[in-house]
């Protein structure tokens, strides 16, 4: 469940709202696990996907755009 | 269109059992998470339990071993076994789905199914 | 755990604005959702992500959120707004809703 685009295929439950004990640092997660929504603070942390939160590593991670790769989905997929 | 229809409420006796459904059309069903909250009458609205589309499962601590939520993705349909049912369990209980990841708002509810336990 | 706290009831005159409040420790930092019920139907999602509307809301209705309140508003306020209104958030693992707020247009 890499790059793909918005949809809701990769369900999983709320982790909480952590606030600051977040860690700030992630790569796109490629194992299966739970994910819920990111806590607010990552409101802008996708730039061109959607955000989502791991539980079990409490680190944002990102389901980017169609033609968008990267952790943060921040550069253009030059093969899409 | 999109709807969820609640079923298997009732009257049962304090420590019985009962298990509710949820039917689910319109979207796919397996793609989102799912919750219960219920309503005690002239009572605001209280989340139960919720699943997520791979299974993980969170209860709210009054129901912590005695209910359980469960799917059944090929029929789309979700559950509530409510089991050692006590008379403050008394509610409207509305099944709602969760846009998205959990965590989001529940853009879709049911129209909910009252729960009525008393001897 | 986390509480959300609502006014019992807010009273508004037809056509008025109103106003309905819910307080949380620090809830500026969490999304916060406002669903409307009537009575005998299932609740109604009018506000999410603090001030967005989903389709079919009127652009009456709006929202705030920031430091530790955030605020439902109902503005030229019809006789069919009348009804409880719920906030909600999320919080460890849970769901948290308010204790509702019954609105009567006057």
């Known amino acids: 469940d890499g790059n793909s685009t918005r949809s809701p295929e990769t369900n999983g439950l709320l982790c909480g709202d952590p606030e600051e004990n977040c860690a700030a640092t992630t790569t796109q997660s490629k194992r299966k696990g739970h994910f819920s929504r990111c806590p607010k603070q990552y409101k802008h942390y996708c730039i061109k996907g959607r955000c989502r939160f791991v539980v079990a590593e409490q680190t944002p991670s990102c389901v980017c755009d169609e033609g968008y790769i990267g952790a943060r989905c921040e550069r253009v997929d030059l093969f899409y | 269109q999109v709807q969820l229809l609640e079923s298997g409420g009732g009257l049962v006796q304090p420590g019985g059992s009962l298990r509710l459904s949820c039917a689910a059309s319109?979207?796919?069903?397996?793609?989102?998470?799912m919750s219960w909250v219920r309503q005690a009458p002239g009572k605001g609205l209280e989340w139960v339990s919720g699943l997520g589309h791979v299974g993980y499962t969170t209860y709210t601590d009054s129901v912590k071993g005695r209910f359980t939520i469960s799917r059944d993705n090929s029929k789309n349909t979700l559950y509530l076994q409510m089991n050692s049912l006590r008379a403050e369990d008394t509610a409207v209980y509305y099944c709602a789905r969760d846009y998205l990841d959990f965590g989001y708002y529940f853009d879709v509810w049911g129209q909910g199914t009252l729960v009525t336990v008393s001897s | 755990s986390y509480e959300l706290t609502q006014p019992l009831s807010v009273s508004v005159a037809l056509g008025q604005t109103a106003r309905i409040t819910c307080s949380g420790d620090?809830?500026?930092?969490?999304?916060v959702h406002w669903y409307q019920q009537k009575p005998g139907q299932a609740p109604v999602l009018v506000i999410y992500d603090d001030s967005d509307r989903p389709s079919g809301i009127p652009e009456r209705f709006s929202g705030s959120n920031s430091g530790n309140t955030a605020t439902l508003t109902i503005s030229r306020a019809q006789a069919g707004d009348e009804a409880d209104y719920y906030c909600?958030?999320?919080?460890?693992?849970?769901?948290?809703f308010g204790g509702g707020t019954k609105l009567t247009v006057l």
């Open positions: 620090k809830i500026g930092k969490k999304y």
């Open positions: 909600q958030a999320w919080d460890m693992q849970s769901v948290v």
């Open positions: 319109g979207f796919t069903f397996s793609s989102y998470a």
